[in-house]
């Protein structure tokens, strides 16, 4: 399927001009390659009429141009002084020959309709209203006023001043006069439909002295706005229907042969195909609203219409706005898993794509809620603190420059299942939807922290250990301290990276974190996690409470005493070296810095990781080490 897109049908009248916009995928090659407009002949040949290389055919000389807009990935063909000879089939396309990527456009140029010379033309959109002005001489002031619509043989009454109204205009037509002006009457017709188009005559008086005026009412279907979007990206339908329908229910529907199937409306209706990826946002008192759809699929392409009516359904004679949506399958948005699976008590790390050209944009993660018009409250963001009910279990890790940020959610429950959106405050096309599925856990978690009831004593040394399985042996282990602004990685000293090791003892794989001495600020949530480069994996969380020493009490949990003692012994030597290092000022390279310097000490590689929030006060050590 060609990724070029434009208007399928263009119509105009003789003497007028048209402007045809064609869209192409956002690539450097496409921006610079030849653009053309050609006319299809009976033989199937397409004869170039104009191209971006400067070619202009004889029949277009002085009346057409082609302009490339590389910043929008569009080119525009402008043609003036149209004649009926311009009616035909055309292609707009890209490439060195006219057999390149293209889109078919049908152009129809019709004759200017012949109307009586004194005809007043009113041009209105479907669903709107028209007020026809009917002047008359003063002597016809007492006479009957009327408006009729011309049919083949006669003129059928619409409304008159004796309050006679044609059944098809009841509730829609009003005849009135303004103020004291006795030389003009007006007829207002509301909720215009295609059937209302035609010639009308307004009349005051009877016989040869009557005042008559010819009126031509043209009722137009709105020209569809073209929307060119990438697969997996998002689209916003901005609908502006006017103040007169501000209080009516709003809808967005998709054309399906003769009908328009409602996708979403403000009365709570929503097409199941759009579950988790659509929102309708009533904007204001002016009848404006918008519909956001994320995670575009190729089957989403088509003709869309928005409107307003108390039923929340399309209704003839009510204002509408239309779009033609094209979904380009040559997408710049990476193909990521749209479903992420987790288990209760476990964690998920969700990689969110963003436009790499906008690495400084603010990143957000929200949870889609389908009730009412739909909402997506932001749970966390680069500068948006974690929502309170997610305390200790949600963080956003921004990896500047690589087009991805990661959201980690742990301590999962079945309540967390649902749809989530990744988005930024920049390019809105890069909104993506993730469905999170949470199943009941059937086995022990991969990461386990001991002691599980962690209470540290002020001023003492406190160690917690995180046990991990052999499958995580080669991955980087880390501890981080959670706050509502992120999870700040602590400096780590990895004892486990022995070059010669070929076996893995399942029972002794652990990464420990030591607080020495414990201070009141150490209280809070800590995460133990694994990552491979910039790809985050599983995490587990623990809350460490800090309390003052009570006389005669031990802060070591008896059930964990042996394990704790063992860990403490194994870590003792490492800790003394850490304390020395950490008493020196550690530069603060930012919240997620990950600078590593490897020092070989015997057969042991000791890895240091300095990180923001890692610097500690004199005499204090905050570290994690792994075996």
């Amino acid at each position: 399927k060609s990724p070029i897109f434009g208007p399928q049908e263009v119509s105009s009248i003789e003497g007028d001009s048209v402007s045809i916009t064609c869209y192409y995928p956002d690539t450097s090659v496409n921006r610079h390659t030849r653009k053309y407009w050609c006319r299809q002949g009976a033989s199937g040949m397409c004869t170039t009429l104009i191209s971006s290389n400067g070619y202009l055919s004889k029949e277009y000389s002085g009346r057409a141009n082609l302009i490339n807009f590389p910043e929008n990935n569009t080119f525009v063909i402008n043609i003036e002084q149209l004649t009926q000879d311009d009616t035909g089939s055309y292609k707009c396309g890209l490439g060195t020959s006219n057999r390149g990527l293209s889109f078919d456009v049908s152009l129809e140029v019709s004759q200017v309709p012949e109307l009586p010379s004194d005809t007043h033309v009113y041009t209105k959109d479907i669903g709107r209203n028209v007020t026809i002005e009917c002047p008359f001489k003063r002597e016809n002031a007492p006479s009957k006023k009327s408006l009729c619509k011309k049919t083949n043989q006669s003129c059928e009454l619409v409304i008159d001043s004796t309050e006679k109204v044609n059944p098809s205009y009841i509730g829609r037509a009003k005849l009135f006069m303004k103020g004291t002006d006795l030389t003009v009457f007006y007829v207002n017709i509301s909720h215009l439909t295609h059937n209302d188009a035609g010639l009308y005559i307004c009349q005051a008086g009877e016989g040869p002295s009557a005042d008559k005026k010819n009126v031509d009412l043209q009722v137009l279907a709105p020209e569809p706005e073209l929307l060119y979007k990438d697969l997996r990206s998002s689209v916003t339908f901005e609908c502006d229907l006017g103040r007169e329908v501000a209080n009516e229910a709003k809808y967005l529907c998709r054309m399906n042969k003769e009908t328009c199937d409602v996708i979403i409306n403000t009365l709570g209706k929503r097409d199941p195909d759009f579950e988790g990826r659509i929102l309708i946002t009533p904007k204001d008192d002016n009848g404006r609203f918008s519909v956001l759809i994320t995670g575009l699929r190729k089957e989403d392409a088509g003709h869309y219409q928005c409107g307003a009516h108390s039923s929340g359904l399309p209704q003839e004679g009510w204002p509408i706005q239309t779009w033609q949506l094209f979904v380009n399958e040559e997408s710049t948005i990476p193909n990521r898993r749209s479903v992420v699976k987790g288990v209760t008590g476990g964690s998920v790390a969700i990689a969110c794509p963003y436009n790499p050209k906008e690495s400084s944009s603010l990143k957000y993660w929200c949870r889609w809620e389908g009730d009412g018009n739909g909402h997506c409250p932001v749970l966390v963001g680069t500068q948006a603190q974690v929502q309170e009910e997610y305390e200790g279990r949600l963080a956003l890790f921004d990896q500047p420059g690589n087009g991805t940020y990661t959201v980690i959610l742990n301590q999962l429950t079945t309540e967390d299942a649902g749809f989530y959106w990744c988005l930024t405050n920049g390019d809105s096309r890069w909104r993506t939807t993730i469905e999170l599925q949470v199943a009941e856990a059937t086995r022990e978690p991969n990461l386990e922290v001991t002691p599980q009831n962690a209470t540290a004593v002020l001023g003492e040394t406190f160690t917690v250990s995180c046990h991990y399985p052999c499958k995580f042996y080669s991955q980087e282990k880390y501890w981080c301290k959670w706050s509502n602004k992120g999870c700040h990685i602590l400096p780590s000293h990895d004892e486990g990276a022995r070059q010669s090791s070929v076996s893995c003892d399942q029972s002794s794989q652990l990464v420990s974190m030591t607080l020495n001495p414990v201070s009141k600020e150490d209280e809070g949530w800590y995460w133990c996690g694994v990552k491979q480069g910039q790809t985050y994996g599983e995490t587990t969380a623990i809350y460490i409470a800090v309390e003052e020493r009570t006389r005669g009490s031990s802060h070591v949990n008896p059930t964990d005493a042996n394990a704790r003692a063992k860990v403490a012994l194994e870590e003792e030597v490492v800790d003394s070296s850490i304390s020395e290092k950490e008493n020196k000022a550690i530069p603060n390279p930012g919240p997620f810095a990950n600078e590593r310097e490897i020092q070989n000490v015997g057969d042991q590689a000791q890895e240091n990781r300095a990180s923001g929030d890692a610097g500690s006060a004199d005499g204090q050590s905050r570290s994690s080490s792994s075996k």
Epitope: L292, P377, Q385, N425
Partner: nanobody, 131 residues
Framework: EVQLVESGGGLVQAGGSLRLSCAAS????????MGWFRQAPGKEREFVAA????????DYADSVKGRFTISRDNAKNTVYLQMDSLKPEDTAVYYC????????????????????????WGQGTQVTVSS
């Protein structure tokens, strides 16, 4: 409840620049759309500029377009108004205002120039532009 405190006003010559700041108290700063309004002596309070809760959308009064820039730093709970090419007619008390919109995708681009839509107001800071 949010408290708003404006600063940065003062006396400046025509053609000069000033940067106003509005510091907000409270943890939920990023659930407010913010705006700047001004009131010249003997005149009604008028809209100057507004910014959505994400900072992704802004709006300006025609009289200041191209000269004033509104921005925000959610990490610092602060909204700014950079005023360049100042004119004597910019002389007024400048007020910072906050509209509760909630941190939601549906309000990401919401900005308002209507005084009645704002829920909280600062005390104002005087800007005087001399010719």
């Amino acid at each position: 409840e949010v408290q708003l405190v404006e600063s940065g006003g003062g006396l400046v010559q025509a053609g000069g620049s000033l940067r106003l700041s509005c510091a907000a108290s409270g943890r939920t700063f990023d659930s407010y759309a913010m705006g700047w309004f001004r009131q010249a002596p003997g005149k009604e309070r008028e809209f100057v500029a507004a910014i959505s809760w994400t900072g992704g959308s802004t709006d300006y009064a025609d009289s200041v377009k191209g000269r004033f820039t509104i921005s925000r730093d959610n990490a610092k709970n602060t909204v700014y108004l950079q005023m360049d090419s100042l004119k004597p007619e910019d002389t007024a008390v400048y007020y910072c205002a906050a509209e509760v919109v909630g941190r939601d995708v549906t309000t990401m681009y919401r900005v308002s120039g209507l005084e009645y839509e704002y829920d909280y107001w600062g005390q104002g800071t005087q800007v005087t532009v001399s010719s």
